[in-house]
Interface confidence: medium
């Protein structure tokens, strides 16, 4: 009783990104405790006066929760005992971006870690052959991006080639007036080649590949969040 010492525990977060309008996860883990009632989780956001979320004595304690997070947060209550303090954030908003602190108290001590959370919009592109065009044309479409991304075309056969002169990219604002639809058209494509449409902003990088041969068309898409690091 009244033992002296540093009493710090290890808390680990992972920088992540939230997709506007979808649910997001702010990841945080800590050294677990054997007793749930001795664990307190507090999520805080820099510049926000109230708490983002508080979990203590085995349940949510939301009396000090800030208005901007009201009804939008939850921890994985059944996983707290094993050291998971990750926060689920409903309906991610652009304004949710910022520095968060995952603050943990257990009977072993306390600790915290900061987490940089970026918000934006990102989606998988789809590349199709545009049969309506007069020449062989590819059309790359991605429904939701923000901030405005860059679009670059590449090909397997002509590696290192610059396709900016033979492509045209447009951005169309979506109905909620934040995200935009990305459409990029590549002209003068050749058969028996694989083309890649690469869309990138500071949050995510997505690639849509299409392989066109005389007998078939093969497609593949990939999305990578750029700021996810331990």
């Amino acid at each position: 009783f009244g033992i002296s010492g540093r009493h710090s525990i290890t808390v680990t977060t992972v920088a992540s990104a939230g997709n506007i309008g979808e649910d997001g996860i702010l990841s945080c883990t800590f050294e677990p405790d054997i007793k749930l009632s001795d664990i307190v989780i507090q999520w805080l956001k820099e510049g926000v006066l109230g708490l983002v979320h508080e979990f203590k004595e085995g349940k949510d304690e939301l009396s000090e929760q800030d208005e901007m997070f009201r009804g939008r947060t939850a921890v994985f209550a059944d996983q707290v005992i094993v050291g998971n303090a990750s926060l689920r954030l409903k309906n991610v908003q652009l304004t949710d971006a910022g520095t968060y602190k995952c603050y943990i108290i257990t009977s072993k001590g306390k600790g915290n870690a900061n987490l940089e959370y970026k918000t934006g919009a990102f989606s998988m592109p789809e590349v199709n052959v545009d049969y309506n065009a007069s020449s062989e044309t590819l059309r790359c479409e991605a429904p939701r991006w923000f901030p405005q991304p860059t679009v670059v075309w590449a090909s397997q056969v002509d590696q290192g080639a610059n396709f900016s002169e033979v492509s045209n990219t447009s951005f169309e604002l979506n109905s909620e007036n934040v995200t935009m639809k990305v459409v990029s058209v590549l002209y003068n494509v050749t058969i028996n080649n694989t083309y890649s449409c690469m869309i990138e902003n500071d949050i995510a990088k997505a690639t849509g590949d299409i392989k066109v041969t005389e007998s078939e068309i093969k497609r593949r898409s990939h999305l990578q969040l750029l700021n996810s690091k331990a």
């Epitope: 009493h7 710090s8 820099e46 510049g47 004595e57 304690e61 000090e64 001590g109 306390k110």
Partner: antibody, heavy 117, light 107 residues
């Protein structure tokens, strides 16, 4: 609104002991760290130590051997036991809730301890 | 221990002046720093938390900046009620340490 009220201060002779109390009302006691901070007359603030509701305490190494912090959750109170007091321990002693957390900042009004013969 | 060096230790200023107080940490403390105002006979009152966030109810003329080892408290236009002593506090590691204080006096 959380309130912290210190008591137990007063005049004590060098070498003597004193126990300060801090009663917490109007808020949860568990899940926070409870701190003692002191301020000698005309001087700056010095952190003494902290304790949580389960009795786990951390001290300022310069004071650890003579000062002990304890807690009584049934009474929503925590305490500072001071032994082998010296003239330089004369100060206003404040209790405070969780200096560590960004969002919580509650202090008691302070209690004066005078060590003099 | 992390040493918090606060400067100046005192300053004289007039109402309406812009006042800047600096705290330097002996090692990096991220943004784990608060600024406190203390008036004679009273407990400290927190003005700024997390180095730059304004405490609820504190006038916007107070602002904080900095990260790592260098931190600043600025009062954009000094008011009569601002004459007090100001302290920084690091809560990055144990033991918690305060700066030595800056007494702001009327010129």
């Amino acid at each position: 609104e959380v309130q912290l009220v210190e008591s137990g201060g007063g005049l004590v002779q060098p070498g003597g002991s004193l126990r300060l109390s801090c009663a917490v009302s109007g808020g949860s006691f568990s899940g926070y760290y409870w701190n003692w901070v002191r301020q000698a007359p005309g001087k700056g603030l010095e952190w003494i130590g902290e304790i949580n509701h389960s009795g786990s305490a951390t001290y300022n190494p310069s004071l650890k051997s003579r000062f002990t912090i304890s807690v009584d959750t049934a009474k929503n109170s925590f305490y500072l036991q001071m032994n082998s007091l010296r003239a330089e321990d004369t100060a206003v002693y404040y209790c405070a809730r969780e200096l560590y957390n960004w969002n919580v900042d509650h202090w008691g009004q302070g209690t004066l301890v005078t060590v003099s013969s | 221990d992390i040493q918090m060096t606060q400067s100046p230790s005192s300053l004289s200023a007039s109402v309406g002046d812009r006042v800047t107080i600096t705290c330097r940490a002996s090692q990096g403390i991220r943004n784990d720093l608060g600024w406190y105002q203390q008036k004679p006979g009273k407990a400290p009152k927190r003005l700024i938390y997390a180095a730059s966030s304004l405490q609820s109810g504190v006038p916007s003329r107070f602002s904080g900046s900095g990260s790592g080892t260098e931190f600043t408290l600025t009062i954009s236009s000094l008011q009569p009620e601002d004459f007090a002593t100001y302290y920084c506090l690091q809560h990055n590691s144990y033991p918690r340490t305060f700066g030595g204080g800056t007494k702001v006096e009327i010129k």
